[in-house]
């Protein structure tokens, strides 16, 4: 038997993936556990094996179909269960009625690229990945730029309150190495959260022209 408190948190990427983390205070002795997804209106059901991510938490990804296929809508509710093997049978450790479009976390933006760079500014674009067409333009972004001698945590957040897949960074220092990241969030969903940050994009501003003011 397992004692202690349990936390079971899942997010839908808006297309064909539900990612779950299960935390359990009590120790599990080499027990095999899985997440089972059972939608209330659809024909599929899916299972994934929970794998340890720390001493007391496990994670897995429910792959519902091809990455860009739309497997759930706003009308769906998915019963999610954590099942752990106890001898010859499975025991339900946690359960939730999961409303996918109330619990969104999109994939990190991809394909970051420098469109144009100057001495003091840089124009960067990106793409969103595996995001549902249901959102239309109802997305927002946050971006941050890593300057020399600073940490990501110190970087000020730039907020784009609309679906704008580019940014023009201003007031940069000439001939300086920077890194840039962006993340995305739908406006929909009570428990929706930001996507992970994108992979950092490194870029360097152009040197100032010799003999000219900078």
């Amino acid at each position: 038997a397992v004692n202690g408190t349990s936390q079971f948190t899942c997010f839908y990427n808006s297309r064909a993936n539900i990612s779950c983390v299960w935390s359990q205070d009590g120790a599990l002795q080499d027990t095999s556990c899985q997440v089972h997804a059972w939608p209330d209106r659809r024909r599929w059901n899916q299972t994934c094996e929970l794998l340890p991510v720390s001493q007391a938490s496990w994670a897995c990804n429910l792959i519902l179909g091809a990455p860009d296929s739309q497997k759930l809508t706003t009308v769906d509710i998915v019963t999610l269960r954590v099942l752990c093997r106890e001898g010859v049978r499975w025991r339900v450790m946690a359960i939730q009625d999961f409303k996918p479009f109330e619990n969104l976390r999109l994939m990190a933006p991809i394909s970051l690229q420098v469109v144009h760079v100057e001495t003091h500014r840089c124009n960067i674009s990106w793409e969103i990945s595996q995001a549902s067409h249901y959102f239309e333009r109802h997305l927002e972004f946050e971006a941050r730029t890593l300057s020399p001698g600073h940490t990501w945590e110190e970087a000020p957040l730039l907020t784009l309150k609309q679906k704008q897949e580019w940014i023009c960074l201003e007031t940069l220092t000439p001939d300086t190495q920077y890194e840039f990241q962006v993340r995305v969030k739908p406006l929909q969903g009570e428990f929706t959260t930001w996507s992970p940050w994108s992979q950092p994009l490194a870029f360097r501003t152009k040197p100032a022209a010799l003999g000219k003011d900078t």
């Epitope: 209330d40 209106r41 659809r42 024909r43 296929s69 739309q70 809508t73 706003t74 009308v75 067409h133 249901y134």
Partner: antibody
């Protein structure tokens, strides 16, 4: 095998109410939504709403202007659809259907005639 | 509400013909599109779910395709029992809506 068996035909006067039943068998009643769909004579299909027997949660078509109520009795695996303030254009065959990626099983239909 | 428009409204064909019925949604419904067959005095029967999934017991001559707003039901070789009315239906969002129907008649 899965079966949905509906109550018999009804004749009602305008302004009255009707309650149609749908008894399910052959599957776990509480695990699938039940929808109600109607079809006026010689016309197409109109979705009225649905109910989840496991929770009693409902969704209604706003076109019915609050005149419809769907309920279940899990002890008898029966779904009910009540339509109030009946009008002549409510004359139709009323179907219950189980939802599972489409309406995969249907009742035989209940003819409700509204006539003065 | 999402409007579903079928074409044609009626169609005459012969046994052995290949027949195509189309359904257009007024907005993107991804693949949440089902097809039904109905014969006079009977309840509809599910043929195809989620655009292309063949419901159990349905002959393989029935197939579905499409995505977004445009969908197709194809009967590869008409049989005598296929003469009926066909409806598309979206289960992308409430209220669920049906096409107006396509009546398939014997030529």
């Amino acid at each position: 095998q899965v079966q949905l068996v509906q109550s018999g035909a009804e004749v009602k006067k305008p302004g009255a109410s009707v309650k149609v039943s749908c008894k399910a068998s052959g599957y776990t009643f509480t695990s699938h939504w039940i929808s109600w769909v109607r079809q006026a004579p010689g016309q197409g299909l109109e979705w009225m709403g649905d109910i989840y027997p496991g929770s009693g949660n409902t969704n209604y078509n706003e076109k019915l202007q609050g005149r419809v109520t769907m309920t279940v009795d899990t002890s008898t695996s029966t779904a009910y659809m009540e339509l109030r303030s009946l009008r002549s254009d409510d004359t139709a065959v009323y179907y219950c259907a189980r939802e599972r990626g489409g309406f995969d099983y249907w009742g035989q239909g209940t003819l409700v005639t509204v006539s003065s | 509400d999402i409007q579903m428009t079928q074409s044609p409204s009626s169609l005459s064909a012969s046994v052995g013909d290949r027949v195509t019925i189309t359904c257009r949604a007024s907005q993107d419904i991804s693949n949440f599109l089902n097809w039904y067959q109905q014969k006079p005095g009977k309840a509809p029967k599910l043929l195809i779910y989620y655009t292309s999934g063949l419901h159990s017991g349905v002959p393989s001559r029935f197939s579905g395709s499409g995505s977004g707003t445009d969908f197709t039901l194809t009967i590869s070789s008409l049989q005598p029992e296929d003469f009926a009315t066909y409806y598309c239906q979206q289960d992308n969002n409430h209220p669920y809506t049906f096409g107006q129907g396509t009546k398939l008649e014997i030529k």
